[in-house]
């Protein structure tokens, strides 16, 4: 196309980004192929893992406040994982967005929605735990699954609200070499007379606000909640941290490690408007740290399983149930009473009031993972939702 590549007004950093060309260097091409492979694998893993977590926590576990938090975190991660295949396609076609402006806006919005939702939900989890320890009587009376769902809905609404500017200012921009960028274009709406000033102020506002709201404030809430809980538990003489504490700690650590670099580069990018010398650094680093932020959604389900033995047990049973229901022979449907009795007993056990992370009867760590992978034929199968519902009414 021999049209002007940039008919709409663009910020200087975008104009210069449009000059950058795809590489013909062979070693860089190999990195590209590896990146496509890695992102493709992450897409698949993220979708499967978060889907399984949603299924296990939502359908195979007794609903508690804790499972509600995990359910919503997994939902946020599933959304992000669902957008990852499109990012993989962007990489596969040579770093060019071929899916149109509307989908560019939607895809980017999902990334930012996940960013805000994760930060807000982790803050809520920490505050919830803090209230349990600092205000136990109040928590006893007000901590219900319904209340947790309501809080989550409010947090999702806030996350959506914070994502709106990223939807509005996302655009497709043609590069000089013919590739298409899906990137910020802060001059899309009311550019004003001073283009440079508008570019600078808006980019800084976006970068600083997302750093504060989606990273610094959540981490501050998490840290202060943890400090308050630690102080209170010290007075009570508690020593070892509970399993749920370890789960939260792992998820928070992953959140900080995966999103921290992204926010650093996002702030550098905002500075690069006024300081062109930062541009090459930003252009080099931003794709990597964005991928790292995406991978947070793939890491979380692994952390739930690794830090939570009961989750692993439920997961194993659920997978066996799915396999059994698929592989079951017609003649076995009206099978012997002994098998029916065995199922009922397992149902009663599954319906017992279990939190997300109860004490396991199984080995921990790598041995547990290995055991799960190899499978334990002796373990009793999990019942379907109908049987569970019926048995729970009698219990």
């Amino acid at each position: 196309m021999s049209a002007n590549a940039t008919l709409k007004p663009l910020c200087p950093i975008l104009e210069q980004m449009s000059r950058l060309q795809s590489h013909s260097n062979t070693s860089i091409r190999y990195i590209d192929h590896a990146a496509v492979l890695l992102h493709g694998l992450a897409s698949l893993l993220g979708l499967v893992e978060n889907g399984v977590i949603l299924f296990v926590v939502g359908c195979r576990m007794r609903q508690t406040v804790v499972t509600t938090w995990v359910l919503h975190l997994a939902l946020s991660d599933l959304l992000a994982s669902a957008s990852l295949p499109f990012f993989t396609y962007f990489l596969a076609v040579g770093h060019s967005w071929e899916l149109g402006t509307t989908f560019c806006k939607l895809h980017s919005s999902i990334f930012f929605l996940n960013m805000f939702a994760s930060g807000f939900l982790l803050s809520a989890i920490s505050l919830d735990r803090c209230l349990q320890v600092v205000r136990p009587v109040w928590a006893q009376n007000h901590r219900t699954v319904a209340a947790a769902h309501k809080v989550c809905l409010v947090l999702w609404a806030l996350a959506v609200l914070n994502t709106v500017p990223y939807f509005v200012f996302r655009d497709t921009i043609s590069r000089l070499d013919g590739r298409i960028m899906c990137y910020y274009n802060v001059l899309l709406l009311n550019p004003g007379p001073d283009r440079d000033a508008t570019c600078n102020s808006r980019q800084v506002a976006l970068a600083v606000s997302k750093f504060l709201l989606a990273f610094l404030v959540p981490l501050a809430i998490i840290a202060s909640s943890h400090a308050a809980v630690s102080l209170r538990l010290q007075h009570r003489g508690r020593r070892r941290p509970g399993r749920f504490v370890r789960l939260v700690a792992a998820v928070v650590a992953a959140f900080a490690l995966c999103w921290g670099p992204y926010h650093v580069f996002s702030l550098l990018e905002a500075r690069a408007h006024a300081n062109p010398g930062l541009r090459p650094l930003v252009w080099r680093g931003l794709p990597f740290v964005t991928s790292l932020a995406f991978f947070n959604s793939v890491a979380n389900p692994v952390l739930y399983v690794l830090t939570c033995p009961d989750m692993l047990r439920k997961l194993r049973r659920s997978l066996r149930t799915v396999l059994e229901s698929v592989l079951v022979d017609d003649s076995e449907l009206g099978g012997a009473g002994s098998s029916r009795r065995r199922r009922t007993s397992s149902t009663a056990r599954s319906a017992s009031p279990l939190a997300l992370c109860s004490r396991p009867e199984e080995p921990r760590g790598p041995a547990r993972l290995l055991g799960w992978l190899l499978g334990s034929c002796a373990a009793s199968p999990q019942t379907g939702p109908l049987n569970r519902a019926l048995s729970s009414t009698s219990s």
Partner: antibody
Framework: QVQLQQSGTGLVRPGTSVRVSCKAS????????IEWIKQRPGQGLEWIGV????????HYNEKFKGKATLTADTSSSTAYMQLSSLTSGDSAVYFC???????????????WGQGTSVTVSS | DIQMTQSPSSLSASLGERVSLTCRAS??????FSWLQQKPDGTIKRLIY???TLDSGVPKRFSGSRSGSDYSLTISSLESEDFADYYC?????????FGGGTKLEIK
């Protein structure tokens, strides 16, 4: 070696158009950008715009939008600049120059053509 | 647009003399800056890019430096072929802009 060979001097009438050519040799034409620059007699240099020969995408200085049209023919490794509705103010020497970029950085105008003098006179 | 203010506009110097030309950018350009030489026959050659990197084939007597928004071109010992017009160029932001030029003449 890298060379940019421009077309010869042109004497044109006001209101008409002129096309200046810039033939590249000694490098892969489609992997570099071609910039166009104007120099009025006894004056400084002014950037007109840039074209990517591989895609045909271009970017113009606001001042030259509607005046200059940049094109490229990859088969002959030649870049063109068409100047329309010529006035005496368009009388100048026009240069083409090569610029490069990588995935992460760019540089400007490492090799220049010898210039094409365009005189607009009735 | 970024303004490039070049000084002096003309300079007379003798062979073997050391001379410096300066260019000031109206905005931060972070070294996206070049020095160009235009010979009396009109041909243009880039001498320096990225504020201080010498182009291949350019004699070592030419050097570029930067101090904040001020950029300098120094010729340590003038030779006869150095008498020409010199222009600075910023390529940080569109539209790329040039300095007004410095005419270097033999004293």
């Amino acid at each position: 070696q890298v060379q940019l060979q421009q077309s010869g001097t042109g004497l044109v009438r006001p209101g008409t158009s002129v096309r200046v050519s810039c033939k590249a040799s000694g490098y892969a034409f489609i992997t570099y950008l071609i910039e166009w620059i104007k120099q009025r007699p006894g004056q400084g240099l002014e950037w007109i715009g840039v074209i990517h020969p591989g895609s045909g995408n271009s970017h113009y200085n606001e001042k030259f939008k509607g005046k200059a049209t940049l094109t490229a023919d990859t088969s002959s490794s030649t870049a063109y600049m068409q100047l329309s509705s010529l006035t005496s103010g368009d009388s100048a020497v026009y240069f083409c120059a090569r610029s490069g970029s990588s995935s992460f950085d760019y540089y400007a105008m490492d090799f220049w053509g010898q210039g094409t003098s365009v005189t607009v006179s009735s | 647009d970024i303004q490039m203010t070049q000084s002096p506009s003309s300079l007379s110097a003798s062979l073997g003399e050391r001379v410096s030309l300066t260019c000031r950018a109206s905005q931060e350009i972070s070294g996206y800056f070049s020095w160009l030489q235009q010979k009396p026959d009109g041909t243009i050659k880039r001498l320096i890019y990225a504020a201080s990197t010498l182009d291949s084939g350019v004699p070592k007597r030419f050097s570029g430096s930067r101090s904040g928004s001020d950029y300098s071109l120094t010729i340590s010992s003038l030779e006869s072929e150095d008498f020409a017009d010199y222009y600075c160029l910023q390529y940080a932001n569109y539209p790329y802009t040039f300095g007004g030029g410095t005419k270097l003449e033999i004293k």
